[in-house]
Interface confidence: low
Amino acid sequence: KLNSIKSSLGGETPGQAANRSAGMYQGLAFGGSKKGKNLGQAYPCSSDKECEVGRYCHSPHQGSSACMVCRRKKKRCHRDGMCCPSTRCNNGICIPVTESILTPHIPALDGTRHRDRNHGHYSNHDLGWQNLGRPHTKMSHIKGHEGDPCLRSSDCIEGFCCARHFWTKICKPVLHQGEVCTKQRKKGSHGLEIFQRCDCAKGLSCKVWKDATYSSKARLHVCQKI
């Protein structure tokens, strides 16, 4: 099992590698490396649980497996793990978890949470028996986590922004120092990107990485201290 996740670890220190081989697992061994941080990039995996929230492990017949963004409602699937949080795979299609059964209506299942202050449980007014043939409506104050659908960055938890991923917009992590970023050439060019990146975190700006090992033509941009 250990060998199966080796390739999903990014730039680990020798000490970290030693820890892992001794049977320890790091908090982000399953997808927290720089390589896997941006949802637009794929990285190897051997099972769904090695991918960050909002992704599943896609294993093609040929080529290497990779963590892919989860399938939304009404998209085709082969198993539950392929479907986004609060949905499951039913007859080859991702459907809301509660659509096929009569069950208490809980507005935010899974990764998002709306809980009362005292004990972290749902408030009574969130529960009520309903025939759940209709889709959930997320309450506006529930923040999206990584991979969750969004309309604007304020829909995402702190440290994440709302960015385009294929034809949808999902919460992605704000970029940290040393991470590759996208320099806006002209206003509004964000709209052309299929895999849009977040901006650099506070106190960082997206600048050309001046490194002799990279050709000047590559013009790689990286988040650097202002």
């Epitope: 099992k1 990014g10 730039g11 220190t13 820890n19 320890m24 697992y25 790091q26 908090g27 982000l28 399953f30 997808g31 927290g32 490396s33 720089k34 941080k37 099972s47 769904d48 649980k49 960050e52 929230v53 539950d80 793990g81 949080p85 609060s86 499951r88 978890v97 809980i106 299942l109 899974d110 990764g111 949470r113 972290g120 749902y122 986590h145 990584e146 938890i157 440290g159 994440f160 919460c171 992590p173 940290h176 120092q177």
Partner: antibody
């Protein structure tokens, strides 16, 4: 999200005991389930965790001969069996869900109410 | 295993006072690839289950009052309650959520004068 643990257990030394934790309100097979021990008036001790999708288990070496973790996907229930209990195993045992806190993380965001196990002859 | 050391073991404060408790880890909890510290704080009120307050050292869990502030990096971490309330009477535990085996501190008991 709710984690409902089984009731208090009074067990004889040496007689194994199986605790249960029924999960509801989320996709059971997508999250690691942790088990944590707390002896009276003491701190928290991580026993191990199990991933319901394929029953992969990671145990604290201290508990490798003591605890066996299993799941039943059909009922969204996690189990922990304690073998050959002694007075040292008298404690409250909690199940707690792995927190998907934006990034993959091993913090625990939802906890069961705890099961009190008393080992006594 | 990573050893978590909490101090003080107990403290008594009056309502409205600022409370600071410390947690030190035997090795760094900073993940250099994403600059996050894998340190969580839990509150356990008498007779109740632990409740997650803060994760990634400084991110408050939803529904947690903003008087609870987590800070620190690497091996030294602090939980501050800016203005303690009577309902904050509890044990507070830190936990590293970086590497298995996951480990907790022994706890800080907060009493209200």
């Amino acid at each position: 999200v709710k984690l409902q643990e089984s009731g208090a257990e009074l067990v004889r030394p040496g007689a194994s005991v199986k605790l249960s934790c029924k999960a509801s309100g989320y996709s059971f097979t997508n999250y690691w389930m942790n088990w944590v021990k707390q002896r009276p008036g003491q701190g928290l001790e991580w026993i191990g965790m199990i991933h319901p999708s394929d029953s992969e288990t990671r145990l604290n070496q201290k508990f490798k001969d003591k605890a066996t973790l299993t799941v039943d996907k059909s009922s969204s229930t996690a189990y922990m069996q304690l073998s050959s209990p002694t007075s040292e195993d008298s404690a409250v045992y909690y199940c707690a869900r792995e927190g998907r806190l934006g990034l993959r993380s091993y913090a625990m965001d939802y906890w069961g109410q705890g099961t009190t196990v008393t080992v006594s002859s | 295993d990573i050893v978590m050391t909490q101090s003080p073991s107990s403290l008594a404060m009056s309502v409205g006072q600022k409370v600071t408790m410390s947690c030190k880890s035997s090795q760094s909890l900073l993940n250099s690839s994403n600059q996050k510290n894998y340190l969580a704080w839990y509150q356990q009120k008498p007779g109740q289950s632990p409740k997650l307050l803060v994760y990634f050292a400084s991110t408050r869990e939803s529904g947690v009052p903003d008087r609870f502030v987590g800070s620190g990096s690497g091996t030294d971490f602090t939980l501050t309650i800016t203005s303690v309330q009577a309902e904050d009477l509890a044990d507070y535990f830190c936990q590293q959520h970086y590497i298995t085996p996951l480990t907790f501190g022994a706890g800080t008991k907060l009493e209200i004068k």
